[in-house]
Amino acid sequence: IPVIEPSVPELVVKPGATVTLRCVGNGSVEWDGPPSPHWTLYSDGSSSILSTNNATFQNTGTYRCTEPGDPLGGSAAIHLYVKDPARPWNVLAQEVVVFEDQDALLPCLLTDPVLEAGVSLVRVRGRPLMRHTNYSFSPWHGFTIHRAKFIQSQDYQCSALMGGRKVMSISIRLKVQKVIPGPPALTLVPAELVRIRGEAAQIVCSASSVDVNFDVFLQHNNTKLAIPQQSDFHNNRYQKVLTLNLDQVDFQHAGNYSCVASNVQGKHSTSMFFRVVESAYLNLSSEQNLIQEVTVGEGLNLKVMVEAYPGLQGFNWTYLGPFSDHQPEPKLANATTKDTYRHTFTLSLPRLKPSEAGRYSFLARNPGGWRALTFELTLRYPPEVSVIWTFINGSGTLLCAASGYPQPNVTWLQCSGHTDRCDEAQVLQVWDDPYPEVLSQEPFHKVTVQSLLTVETLEHNQTYECRAHNSVGSGSWAFIPISAGAHTHPPDEFLFTP
């Protein structure tokens, strides 16, 4: 570490005095201090001498000696006071620029350490400091305003009490700049615009920033528009607003509009699209298939997307049958707006009942007319089965009716013993009926099929079972012949009560 002679931390001299500061290090050394007149510098290898034979108050300051070749970067310092009775302050800079929340050092150096007790900081023309100004003083460095605020951008003077009167320094202008986090914030409204040719339209581009230095412009299809700018300041932000008013829009006004704002931090831009149409429009669509199949008891949401201009004058869901005359409950219908011209309408159908199968229509109306979108809802049902014994053309026949949706498949089983349901171990014969006769097949209803099993002789210690299945489930009916005549026995699983 370099060594300074005289080896004192502070040196107090009078104006006109001769001052010699000598620094010695292991290698070459350098001096650093406040810019002031009358110093001469003499270097000789590992020592450097800073001297003046006419010290003035402007030589007041801290002089630091460093050894550039020292990897530890050691230094030594001495503070020089040149105490001039007429000049208590040496001001090193008349303008200080900091960002908000930084500490601002106002570099008025006291020329006489004895005066430290009577120093203060004021604004020019003797005005007091603003409330909540938090500052401290160091005779070596000056006044520090801690965590400076934009509002503290003022002209300041350092004051010292000399012989009962206050002596001021020259003024120091403090500029506290707002921290600009990035380019100005932008809004462009509306985000999307549709108008019929001849209607009026307004597009508003506004930008705001904590700093007044920013530019904003509105462009249409890459052409900058000449629009008068309105400026305002509120919520601690500067605001610049461009308003484009179009009394009667035409097709050439359509296209892309961009709002662009820039400052030292960069550029922001946001865009919107303006569509000019010949007349009102209303379009209905759905991402869902318009033909829906759901298992009975399940829930279903029907969703319709609406694109319209002007806005809707009315809309509703209607049940078109073919069953009851019930209408969807309004509480089950729900509307959400994606944006100004697009909406989604949902009809919620919880725990569907058989009477709720059929056609559901969404109707909407605007000045362009009315449109409808219709869904067809078919319910799926597990098969219901029943078996009866009858004679057809003189032959004993088991007749199985199965009803469900989708159309059930039918299988006959013959098994030994009397049982509610044939299990594998008991099965004697199996007949698949690939083409049962379709008895009824109306839209939105169950499909009823009939399968005949001709039996020459009913074996009394056996069971004949008709099984039906589809994608939803299965059902069966066991027929148990008894000596007193044919007897049918529906096992407990059957959904059908004959």
Epitope: G297, E298, G299, S348, R351, L495
Partner: antibody, heavy 116, light 106 residues
């Protein structure tokens, strides 16, 4: 007042059937659906099926092959029959008034114990 | 089937506490969620239906919220009679219930 009163506790052998009754008072089975919900010991609630006002039924798939729900409107009584009983069917069975979107009236419950 | 996942499965609290129980559906069930309270040896009792509607006769300290897949039952200030098991249930499709939340005295 509006209530559902169920039949008493049953002890059944595996493979047999049980039929639980549920008598409604203060409202009609022609205007309200009835669902059945069961609760195994220390377990949660499990919906079994519903009988609608028109007499149609809808069953939860785990029970579809074994459960039959019926009703007798003249006596305002609903029934739930469960066949091919096994030990895991030991539970409390509740009949409930089904408002489609929630169950607002519950019977006191019928304990069915399946044990050999 | 739609799964209803309730949390927590058990909860200790004191009289006067504010308690929240949540329920998550495996798919969108709109607002077709109800909450039930069950005390030992008794049938469940309806508290909330339609996610947020208070059943007649139920104290106003009970409230429900949510839609879509996430639902909440809140008891604003626990009373001694509120210690019980609570179930959520959905009725958009085949009814299903959460596994229950047992609320115990701390």
């Amino acid at each position: 007042q509006v209530q559902l009163v169920q039949s008493g506790a049953e002890v059944k052998k595996p493979g047999s059937s049980v039929k639980v009754s549920c008598k409604a008072s203060g409202f009609s089975l022609t205007t309200y659906d009835i669902s059945w919900v069961r609760q195994a010991p220390g377990q949660g609630l499990e919906w079994m099926g519903v009988i609608w006002t028109d007499g149609g039924t809808n069953y939860n798939s785990p029970f579809m092959s074994r459960v039959t729900i019926t009703k007798d409107e003249s006596t305002s009584t609903a029934y739930m029959e469960l066949s091919s009983l096994r030990s895991e069917d030991t539970a409390v069975y509740y009949c409930v008034r089904d408002q489609r979107l929630y169950f607002d009236v519950w019977g006191q419950g019928t304990t069915v114990t399946v044990s050999s | 089937d739609i799964q209803m996942t309730q949390s927590p499965s058990s909860l200790s609290a004191s009289v006067g506490d504010r308690v929240t129980i949540t329920c998550r559906a495996s798919e969108d069930v709109n607002t077709y969620v109800s909450w039930y309270q069950q005390k030992p040896g008794k049938a469940p009792k309806l508290l909330i239906y339609g996610a947020s509607s208070l059943q007649s006769g139920v104290p106003s300290r009970f409230s429900g919220s949510g839609s879509g897949t996430d639902f909440t039952l809140t008891i604003s200030s626990l009373q001694p009679e509120d210690f019980a098991t609570y179930y959520c249930g959905q009725s958009f499709s085949y009814p299903t219930f959460g596994q229950g939340t047992k609320l115990e005295i701390k």
